[in-house]
């Protein structure tokens, strides 16, 4: 009874198409597959950034796979051939592993890479990234930002840099068509007459770094003798109402401070007849239904009622 064996895939490699972290893993079928012509061979692929605790595992019939990686670190991957039990009249047969690694050969001491990179997608419309120059780099150092997301043919360079003392310290991006809910890759590299500059790679999704505009049109309405309804409107822009969470700060007679988080554009406040002054501000953030994370907007302008009967008048700012 001869033991059934199968070879690992051939020519296993990680290919960098220049998309700043989105890599292709590809391979060829194993040698001597003739005995298994009636069989659909599968491949088990495992890959990770070096230093990561866990492997991602994929089982596929294809000869390629694509995914995003952190190019600040190396990448390791391994693959083996799987013969399903239907092909072997028994248990599944696995080949030995074929392994490969990939990393960007660095240049420059780590301190030279940009510091404190910060990207904000203002009102889900305008992306702005800013950074500080690396430690100890001279004023002749210039940083360049490149970006890519699925839908672009190739990585693009920033065309509108924010400058300080002649150095690029940020980028205002153009309109980014169909760029949310997918990985957005950035590389900031640099050049200097004085010393080599270390590149930095960043990946995020735009919907997770949105900073909305603050809410507008804050109003009061007396609902009953002891209830006041606070209302506001969503700001102009592409963010739908269903995507907002709000935080309210209410100050009553300069003493009581109420803070609350709500999902709608209204909040009902219990008051006493003694209330002489009421002020509130609101800010907004994209909620968990539309993103995994977000940035609070600035606070709205303050809306106050003072010394008037709220049942007689609705205040509109």
């Amino acid at each position: 009874d001869t033991e059934i064996k199968v070879n690992p895939p051939q020519d296993f490699e990680i290919v960098d198409p220049g998309y700043l972290g989105y890599l292709y893993l590809q391979w060829q079928p194993p040698l001597s597959l003739d005995h298994f012509k009636e069989c659909t061979v599968e491949y088990e692929l495992k890959y990770r950034n070096i230093g990561s605790e866990t492997w991602k595992t994929i089982i596929t019939k294809n000869l390629h796979y694509k995914d995003g990686f952190d190019l600040n670190k190396g990448i390791e991957a391994k693959i083996h051939t799987l013969l399903p039990w239907q092909c072997t009249n028994g248990s599944e047969v696995q080949s030995s592993w074929a392994e490969t690694t990939y990393w960007i050969s660095p240049q420059g001491i780590p301190e030279t890479k940009v510091q404190d990179m910060d990207c904000v997608y203002y009102n889900w419309q305008y992306l702005l990234c800013s950074w500080k120059p690396g430690i100890g780099v001279l004023l002749d150092t210039n940083y360049n930002l490149f970006y890519w997301y699925e839908g672009l043919d190739h990585a693009l360079q920033c065309v509108d840099y924010i400058k300080a003392d002649g150095q690029n310290i940020g980028c205002r991006f153009p309109y980014l068509e169909a760029s949310d809910y997918k990985d957005f890759y950035i590389c900031v590299n640099g050049s200097s007459e004085n010393k080599p500059i270390r590149s930095s790679y960043f990946t995020f999704q735009l919907q997770n770094i949105v900073k909305p505009l603050p809410p507008v049109y804050l109003t009061f309405t007396r609902e009953s003798s002891c209830e006041i309804k606070l209302k506001w409107s969503i700001p102009l822009g592409p963010i739908p109402a269903r995507c907002f969470d709000y935080e309210i700060e209410i100050r009553e007679d300069d003493t009581t401070l109420v803070t609350a988080t709500v999902e709608n554009e209204t909040y009902t406040l219990k008051t006493t007849n003694e209330t002489r002054q009421l002020c509130f501000v609101v800010r907004s953030k994209v909620n968990i239904y539309c993103s995994d994370d977000g940035i609070w907007s600035e606070w709205s302008d303050k809306q106050c009622w003072e010394g008037e009967d709220l049942s007689k008048k609705t205040l509109l700012r």
Epitope: G74, S105, P106, Q107, I109, E111, P196
Partner: antibody
Framework: EVQLVESGGGLVQPGGSLRLSCAAS????????VHWVRQAPGKGLEWVAV???????DYNSALMSRFTISRDNAKNSLYLQMNSLRAEDTAVYYC??????????WGQGTLVTVSS | DIQMTQSPSSLSASVGDRVTITCTAS???????LHWYQQKPGKAPKLLIY???NLASGVPSRFSGSGSGTDFTLTISSLQPEDFATYYC?????????FGGGTKVEIK
């Protein structure tokens, strides 16, 4: 097996010059940066310079005016040209492979003695 | 320059002892760029621990590293005869790259 072998050390007079070599084998030389690190007799380690895989260079600024690092990828070799040598340059000079921002393999070292 | 100060500069210990060596940086160093090397007399240094706490290939598990910011530690949980050597911490964060002065571990 990764190997780094230094050569070119010896006795040289103050003010003289010397060129050290580091022959690399067992890995894809073009993908790695390589450092020179020195150690004076009975003392600690002092970083001299690195030649990155892309060809650029970083030096210990205290030494860069007298020392020049270079590499020949066709020969899998790294070099350190040392000019205007002083007694305090007497040391064992090591080359070391850079991998993931650490020096993971070192040569056995070559002794440079600067004395009249 | 970042000064790396090791203490003690030397210590005497017996086989089986727990040994702790500390390294203090004059400026904060990212834990990614703090490494430890072992050097035996007449030999080249050997990478022992990289990125503060990761054992280099082939290094026994009795070695461990920890720390952050400016304070880092190398620990040998149970000293073995082959561990008698000089140990150096090293920062790879800022130029010039610098090493600690070394800690010589000798047989008591």
């Amino acid at each position: 097996e990764v190997q780094l072998v230094e050569s070119g050390g010896g006795l040289v007079q103050p003010g003289g010059s010397l060129r050290l070599s580091c022959a690399a084998s067992g890995f894809t030389f073009t993908k790695y940066g390589v450092h020179w690190v020195r150690q004076a007799p009975g003392k600690g380690l002092e970083w001299v310079a690195v030649k990155w895989a892309g060809g650029s260079t970083d030096y210990n600024s205290a030494l860069m005016s007298r020392f020049t690092i270079s590499r020949d990828n066709a020969k899998n070799s790294l070099y350190l040209q040392m000019n205007s040598l002083r007694a305090e340059d007497t040391a064992v000079y090591y080359c070391a492979r850079d991998h993931r921002d650490a020096m993971d393999y070192w040569g056995q070292g070559t002794l440079v003695t600067v004395s009249s | 320059d970042i000064q790396m100060t090791q203490s003690p500069s030397s210590l005497s210990a017996s086989v089986g002892d727990r040994v702790t060596i500390t390294c203090t940086a004059s400026l904060s160093v990212s834990s990614t760029y703090l490494h430890w090397y072992q050097q035996k007399p007449g030999k080249a240094p050997k990478l022992l621990i990289y990125s503060t706490s990761n054992l280099a290939s082939g290094v026994p598990s009795r070695f461990s590293g920890s720390g952050s910011g400016t304070d880092f530690t190398l620990t040998i949980s149970s000293l073995q005869p082959e561990d008698f050597a000089t140990y150096y911490c090293h920062q790879y964060h800022r130029s010039p790259l610098t090493f600690g002065g070394g800690t010589k571990v000798e047989i008591k």
